[in-house]
Interface confidence: medium
């Protein structure tokens, strides 16, 4: 999906309003120094591409993030403010429903969400002008 035509200001507002709290809740009890930030992004569409990938693409050691509250809100936000996004996700959602996995918060998942927090911050910093 090409995120170029999203309403970035509205996505930023949704992040500040609700998604950030869910990410903080998920990461509660860990420190940023526990993980190395290895994922970055260079502009707004690129940040959203990386955010989508880390949030919704299962990895061998972290398969369940898409069911977390922050992921559900991220999906709703992208569907709301990125034209045509929801249509591109229908097949992916149906495929996910067939692979029901036990919900486990592994260290790998915590590392992945730590990366997400960094990507969201980077997304916002590409929106804002230094005063």
């Amino acid at each position: 999906y090409d995120f170029t035509n999203c309403d970035f200001q509205k996505i930023e507002a949704d992040y500040l309003r609700t998604i950030s709290k869910d990410l903080i809740t998920y990461m509660s009890g860990t420190k940023s120094t526990d993980f190395n930030n290895t994922v970055s992004c260079s502009n707004r569409p690129h940040c959203l591409t990386e955010i989508q990938s880390l949030t919704f693409n299962p990895t061998p050691r972290c398969a369940s993030l898409a069911k977390e509250m922050f992921a559900r809100k991220t999906k709703a936000t992208l569907a709301l403010w990125c034209p045509g996004y929801s249509e591109t996700q229908i097949n992916a959602t149906q495929a996910m429903k067939k692979r029901r996995k036990r919900k486990v918060t592994t260290n790998k998942c915590l590392e992945q969400v730590s990366q997400l927090l960094g990507l969201w911050r980077r997304f916002i910093r590409t929106l804002l002008k230094k005063q």
Partner: nanobody
Framework: EVQLVESGGGLVQPGGSLRLSCAAS??????????IGWFRQAPGKEREGVSC????????YYADSVKGRFTISRDNSKNTVYLQMNSLRPEDTAVYYC??????????????????WGQGTLVTVSS
């Protein structure tokens, strides 16, 4: 549960002072370098940014309407952020909220719509 609890509000005469506190529970301000800010909402008005503090380098930002009168500070050992309010005016009357993850080092204090994590604390400036 992740929560922010604001306290320290009350009734004060014009020219008086108050110190507001914002205490975090369920997470630690320092853990992810969370930026923290104070916002306020007066009856019938939109919420506005008052002040914020960067958790990375301690940089502070203030709305023009409070510069020179309000001071924001943090105590990571107590997981609390403070707003010292001096020379209070009737127009400072509002419910004051704190919020995290607002990147105050990038934009100073700007208005945005957020769901308050706490109940806020009411400040009334009146003679």
């Amino acid at each position: 549960e992740v929560q922010l609890v604001e306290s320290g509000g009350g009734l004060v005469q014009p020219g008086g002072s108050l110190r507001l506190s914002c205490a975090a529970s369920g997470f630690t301000f320092a853990d992810y370098d969370y930026d923290i800010g104070w916002f306020r909402q007066a009856p019938g008005k939109e919420r506005e940014g008052v002040s914020c503090i960067s958790n990375r380098d301690g940089s502070t930002y203030y709305a023009d309407s409070v510069k020179g009168r309000f001071t924001i500070s943090r105590d990571n050992s107590k997981n609390t952020v403070y707003l010292q309010m001096n020379s209070l005016r009737p127009e400072d009357t509002a419910v004051y909220y704190c919020a995290v993850e607002i990147h105050c080092d990038d934009y100073g204090v700007e208005n945005f719509d957020f769901d308050p994590w706490g109940q806020g604390t009411l400040v009334t400036v009146s003679s």
